[in-house]
Interface confidence: low
């Protein structure tokens, strides 16, 4: 048999240890039981609708679900801290009947030297200190316990881990006389997991490590380490998975090169290169081994680290991500877009689509936006007729069925959903865009014209007249 000890012994799942997967005591709810789907396979949507309707009708009976708030717990191990030395922590809403745990990593850029960290501390202290954190938070989007808002995992145990380490969840250095700030992102995740084991995580079946923006990149950097940690701690039966939202960045050439003076204008490769040294950043070991010493920054980029990961990861990424455009020095100010910039933006979408080619579980709408999974309306966007919660459900099923050695996608249940149309907001289900100055909502046609996309240029490749295209876009088709 294969080992399962520390980082050395991470093998097949043996019979569970006495305390890990104990059978529920009498009267304890059991969340999941095997179902034979063969009879309903042909009409899965109708079946799921009935299940959802049943769940929603039973929902009011569950008193524990009435309080939507996640409650703050500062870490008991106070040596694991935010940038300023205050204890890190997490917000938790337990769902006692469930063996699913969702751990969400918050995003919020980063800082990579004393100057821009000082500036961040002055202007965004919540992202560097726990001193002013509220006692509770409301779960939204994938963190919501309402089946209407979160048809995917509404019944899970929800954990929101605030971002207060400014290191893309990668740091492993404490505050000292030499270090003005602590950068302990990677250690915060490990400590949260350790403390949650005492709060019911030890009985989990699935742990989904999710995150948005810097938190999405944090998922890619930490998901395998969490799996190894749980096996090391004696819980190899917990299936660890990742959901990386808006954290799949490209180390592409900037539209206009600028010197590395602050977080926003510094090219991502240079910012991360400097950051790793400043944070004492750690990256997944299998990825690190592929690059020379000093080149670990490569592992912060999704398309380079993803192939080295062992845990299943679902990647969610807008093809025209606003944070990506920002670091590429593209600022859409409301002025008409010159052709050079239009081509740059279209090429960005093409490059991003290419990097997702071999990512079997991905959802990439052709929209100009940033972050999605904890937005209340995260269910609205569709790619090829499939919403993100539906795609995640299909992903769960594909992982559940993978022991059948079938690599073919589940019929009518796609998990690789990447838009192929070539310009921002060519997908009519994209989130509404507002004029930066008037705050007015714009439809797709208005937005494209506002961006300086010539309708003739856009319509031609589609084999359409500009008037036909405008009509289609205005009707949301």
């Amino acid at each position: 048999s294969e080992g399962r000890k520390t980082w050395r012994r991470r093998g097949q799942q043996p019979p569970p240890p006495p305390r890990t997967e104990a059978a529920p005591a009498a009267g304890q709810p059991v969340e999941s039981f095997p179902l034979d789907f063969t009879a309903v396979e042909g009409n899965m949507d109708s079946f799921m609708a009935q299940v959802k309707s049943l769940a929603q009708s039973l929902y009011p009976c569950s008193a524990q679900q009435l309080n939507e708030d996640l409650r703050l717990h500062l870490l008991l191990n106070t040596s694991v801290t935010c940038n300023d030395g205050s204890p890190a922590g997490y917000y938790l809403k337990e769902s006692r009947g469930s063996r699913r745990w969702l751990l969400f990593l918050e995003g919020g850029w980063y800082c990579f030297n004393r100057e821009n960290c000082d500036s961040r501390y002055d202007t965004m202290r919540r992202l560097m200190s726990s001193r002013d954190w509220p006692r509770t938070r409301t779960g939204t989007g994938i963190l919501s316990s309402q089946p209407e808002e979160n048809p995917y995992w509404w019944n899970a145990n929800m954990v929101f881990i605030p971002y207060c380490s400014s290191d893309v969840w990668s740091g492993a250095s404490s505050k000292s006389e030499k270090n003005e700030y602590a950068f302990m992102g990677a250690l915060i995740i490990q400590e949260v997991v350790r403390e949650l084991l005492g709060r019911g995580l030890s009985g989990a079946k699935v742990l989904l490590l999710a995150g948005s923006s810097a938190g999405g990149t944090g998922v890619l950097l930490n998901v395998d380490r969490v799996a190894e940690q749980l096996e090391k701690l004696g819980y190899p039966a917990i299936q660890v998975r990742g959901l990386a939202d808006s954290g799949w960045f490209l180390d592409n050439k900037q539209y206009r090169h600028t010197d590395c003076v602050d977080t926003i204008t510094c090219a991502p490769t240079e910012a991360i290169r400097r950051g790793i040294r400043y944070w004492n950043g750690v990256v997944p070991e299998r990825c690190r081994r592929q690059f020379q010493e000093g080149e670990e920054w490569n592992c912060f980029f999704g398309y380079k680290v993803y192939p080295t990961l062992r845990c299943p990861v679902f990647v969610v990424q807008w093809l025209f991500d606003e944070a990506q455009l920002t670091v590429d020095n593209v600022h859409l100010t409301g002025q008409p877009v010159q052709e050079g910039l239009r081509l740059y933006i279209q090429n960005l979408g093409r490059e991003l689509r290419h990097t997702l080619k071999d990512v079997p579980a991905s959802f990439a709408p052709a929209c100009l936006s940033h972050e999605i999974i904890i937005r209340s309306h995260w269910t609205d966007v569709q790619v090829k007729g499939t919403s993100l919660p539906r795609a995640l459900h299909c992903w769960d099923r594909s992982l559940h069925d993978s022991h059948k050695a079938s690599k073919t996608p589940l019929k009518g249940c796609p998990v690789h959903l990447v838009d192929s149309c070539p310009w921002p907001h060519c997908n009519p289900s994209c989130p509404t865009v507002r004029d930066q100055f008037t705050g007015q909502e714009m439809n797709v046609a208005q937005f494209l014209m506002h961006m300086g996309f010539d309708m003739q240029t856009v319509a031609q490749p589609q084999g359409l007249e500009p008037s036909e295209l405008l009509g289609m876009l205005s009707n949301g088709s």
Partner: antibody, heavy 117, light 112 residues
């Protein structure tokens, strides 16, 4: 600094049992596995098994499953190995070691077990 | 069980020479997590083993850089670039990828 302290020697009669100890200090005991290794005089090393104090989980070498029982007392940060039905074949030096990030990084000095009537 | 075979059994060297010890496993010891948990230990007479190299090629803290490890799959090598008197003793390879974990039979490094 990390230390694993083992008694120097144990003298036991054939057929009896012995419980040897390995006291850990200088680190959080519950976060690292403890391995046990046997070395007969002039011979090589044999892995007996290991114990994870954080969850009570053990892995044994099938060969030692009926011979060795691994336990810990977390309150005193001490790991124990009990060997039963002792014969002269069990006379050896027994080491405990801590498993770090995937490697046996610190070892005790070893306990010399002599089985003799 | 994975059988670890070390060669040579005994290696006579002069101080300052390079020494090379080979270790072959009876099956691939790449772990399912992608790591290869192959370690090298040195045991001096009357002492407990000391870790030199872990995961094939990583030097443990405090180990001089004259020690290096290499290899993959089933074939592994420990090299000492310039042997010093304090390096004499028995070297063991060890695999920690598959239970039960197993040691090689040992190679005795001695003065010519």
């Amino acid at each position: 600094q990390v230390q694993l302290q083992q008694p120097g020697a144990e003298l036991v009669k054939p057929g009896a049992s012995v419980k040897m100890s390995c006291k850990a200090s200088g680190y959080t005991f519950t976060r690292y596995w403890i391995s046990w290794v046997k070395q007969r005089p002039g011979q090589g090393l044999e892995w007996i098994g290991d114990f994870y104090p954080g969850s009570g989980r053990t892995d044994y070498n099938e060969k030692f499953k009926t011979k060795a029982t691994l336990t810990v007392d977390t309150s005193s940060s001490t790991a124990y190995m009990q060997l039963s039905s002792l014969t002269s074949e069990d006379s050896a030096v027994y080491y405990c070691s801590r498993d770090g990030h995937g490697e046996g990084d610190y070892w005790g000095q070893g306990t010399t077990l002599t089985v003799s009537s | 069980d994975v059988l670890m075979t070390q060669t040579p059994l005994s290696l006579p060297v002069s101080l300052g020479d390079q020494a090379s010890i080979s270790c072959r496993s009876s099956q691939n010891i790449v772990h399912s997590n992608g790591n290869t948990y192959l370690e090298w230990y040195l045991q001096k007479p009357g002492q407990s083993p000391k870790l030199l190299i872990y995961k094939v090629s990583n030097r443990f803290s405090g180990v001089p850089d004259r020690f290096s490890g290499s290899g993959s799959g089933t074939d592994f090598t420990l090299k000492i670039s310039r042997v010093e008197a304090e390096d004499l003793g028995v070297y063991y390879c060890f695999q920690g990828s598959h239970v039960p974990y197993t040691f090689g039979g040992g190679t005795k490094l001695e003065i010519k």
